[in-house]
Interface confidence: low
Amino acid sequence: RGVFRRDAHKSEVAHRFKDLGEENFKALVLIAFAQYLQQCPFEDHVKLVNEVTEFAKTCVADESAENCDKSLHTLFGDKLCTVATLRETYGEMADCCAKQEPERNECFLQHKDDNPNLPRLVRPEVDVMCTAFHDNEETFLKKYLYEIARRHPYFYAPELLFFAKRYKAAFTECCQAADKAACLLPKLDELRDEGKASSAKQRLKCASLQKFGERAFKAWAVARLSQRFPKAEFAEVSKLVTDLTKVHTECCHGDLLECADDRADLAKYICENQDSISSKLKECCEKPLLEKSHCIAEVENDEMPADLPSLAADFVESKDVCKNYAEAKDVFLGMFLYEYARRHPDYSVVLLLRLAKTYETTLEKCCAAADPHECYAKVFDEFKPLVEEPQNLIKQNCELFEQLGEYKFQNALLVRYTKKVPQVSTPTLVEVSRNLGKVGSKCCKHPEAKRMPCAEDYLSVVLNQLCVLHEKTPVSDRVTKCCTESLVNRRPCFSALEVDETYVPKEFNAETFTFHADICTLSEKERQIKKQTALVELVKHKPKATKEQLKAVMDDFAAFVEKCCKADDKETCFAEEGKKLVAASQAALGL
């Protein structure tokens, strides 16, 4: 039943070309190249992709042709290293080309930039987009893949093909509609928001694999799949976990053709065996490939089997606990995690992993004790505080969210996190705190039983964004510590951080708080970001400012913006009233 055990192929590139088809092959190679060389112009990438595709076709025709036996890493790496401007554009990344495989590919992976210096994507007018779409549909869609891939170098490639398919469908439908904008813009907004979420979720998977290893990823997958498929047997879940780990290892490692091919095989296997996996898969399995894979990944949890026995019998009361643990530690812990997770769809995956870790630590200690059973008899009691901590935190924060609304809730988190880690750059603090704040509208609407898996697993994704951005330019040993010590304890680690008493406040710089009339033409979201940027800077200047002081200054600031945006001579208003506001704020904060 091993889905991925294939016969050896004389030509790997021919094999993948035949499996995937020309369209998907070209799209995946474009994504791979754009994720590696994030600064290269679109036209250069298209040229490289066309050259690789032509070569692949010669190998399909004759697998024994020259170079067809080379690995995909060798073929793609050689192609990337032909880029003339590699040294000027990418600096030291060009040194990768002096290495041999597999070191060369590892080198390219290390140079992927989570925050590339690229201009913000500005959406053209609807008519302009529709004209471009009709003039050259293929180029238009390739451009979409290229722009997303270079800005999100860990985007899950087969899923990006699904997004591109929806993107194409939106333009096909809406460019014929009477009101093109009303039809298209909501669809593009939805794709943008879903795309950002998808990118962030995949970034956590890759961080888990790359920073904490395959064991950490497999543990996550056991917990999540056991919640989703509680009727499936442990052996079935283990098989799915092994296959899923292979798929994500490949995608995170830049092996996008293998990843897409293996993901398709996994979807096929799941659908062929849905009777022994889940009753919720029927609709998914009737869809075409890309939609099918996406649907399976998002499928709701199946119902828990009735009358599941108590966990204590096998994992606490049994005299064979230490024997079973000693014989195959990871299998026994995997079974514990599977059994616990399938009974608790109401827990977050990270909580389940903390419980499994506590269980493992207890067995390590107790199985070496004089009376192991007496030692581990109360292990489940140790779980209580671990479960209550996220429950209480979510309860408090949902109450705060309901009281404040999203924008002010984000502001409360901005202040909280700036005081915890004031060394982190202002744009990062704003981005991360805004995303943390979205947990309110995303999860607090759910009933208790769904709040924790929604909230804490979402927070894990957002805090991973902080971790990967901070890793590029480490500025805070507290962030480094929370990000690197334990994947599952990142959120509790950040929650436990108090105000950083060692932080030396930033010197006051009036320029930071100087605003111009251009703020009046910004969208509401962009205006919020401006105000939130000012709030972070205020806290960096005055970390001991009280909530009341900050609220007063921010209220004054909002009134100032509103007043000057209504003025006839906006620029003069911003200049004159701005000086007064800065002076008043300094006085209010005692700067």
């Epitope: 060394q423 590029k472 330019t473 500025v475 040993d477």
Partner: antibody
Framework: EVQLVQSGAEVKKPGESLKISCKGS????????IGWVRQMPGEGLEWMGI????????RYSPSFEGQVTISADKSISTAYLQWNSLKASDTAMYYC????????????WGQGTLVTVSS | QSALTQPASVSGSPGQSITISCSGI?????????VSWYQQYPGKAPKLIIY???KRPSGVSNRFSGSKSGNTASLTISGLQADDEAEYSC???????????FGGGTQLTVL
């Protein structure tokens, strides 16, 4: 190719001010920290402080806090180290280095600027 | 006064191996392997030879290797050559203000 080129040697009197420079080229100057290192005659190396030219975020080692000022002008890819009032004990060779992250390695170094302070 | 302690000098004959120690690595620097080694010839700028405890920049001979045990990092030079004679300094993240510190430096003499 990555290069850090420092300004030439300086001979100054105690109490005078001085600003030495370090110009980066061959890489994205705003994306890497620049560190300044002092080496007094016959002595070891000492990290003085670091700056991130992208946003001018600056950190000083405790023993150099208040003694020197580190700054940068990203428009000309140049970092600076300055003294308002030199002392004889500031006589040393000063190096700038490009850093990978705050806490990591200095992979490219300037050639050094010799500062001599003597009455 | 440096927070990292190195021997003032070590010596060895051509072909031998020598090890230079660097003690006082903070637990944070140790956990995340934030230790570098630099080689410096008289009148020249330092050159990075080891980073993140064990890694060598491209172009640095594999005769240079790094390791760490507890709060002590070590630099080993095998197959000693005359042009290895130089000053060697370790550097580590200090945690305070996120600025690194250097060891006092070790003068290597090739006999």
């Amino acid at each position: 190719e990555v290069q850090l080129v420092q300004s030439g040697a300086e001979v100054k009197k105690p109490g005078e001010s001085l600003k030495i420079s370090c110009k980066g080229s061959g890489y994205s100057f705003t994306n890497y920290w620049i560190g300044w290192v002092r080496q007094m005659p016959g002595e070891g190396l000492e990290w003085m402080g670091i700056i991130y030219p992208g946003d001018s975020d600056t950190r000083y080692s405790p023993s150099f806090e208040g003694q020197v000022t580190i700054s940068a002008d990203k428009s000309i890819s140049t970092a600076y180290l300055q003294w308002n009032s030199l002392k004889a004990s500031d006589t040393a060779m000063y190096y700038c280095a490009r850093l990978h992250g705050v806490v990591s390695r200095g992979d490219y170094w300037g050639q050094g600027t010799l500062v001599t302070v003597s009455s | 006064q440096s927070a990292l302690t190195q021997p003032a000098s070590v010596s060895g004959s051509p072909g031998q191996s020598i090890t230079i120690s660097c003690s006082g690595i903070s637990s944070l620097a140790g956990s995340y392997n934030l230790v570098s080694w630099y080689q410096q010839y008289p009148g020249k700028a330092p050159k990075l030879i080891i980073y993140e405890v064990t890694k060598r920049p491209s172009g640095v001979s594999n005769r240079f290797s790094g390791s760490k045990s507890g709060n002590t990092a070590s630099l080993t030079i095998s197959g000693l050559q005359a042009d290895d004679e130089a000053e060697y300094s370790c550097s580590s993240y200090a945690g305070r203000n996120a600025v690194a510190v250097f060891g006092g430096g070790t003068q290597l003499t090739v006999l």
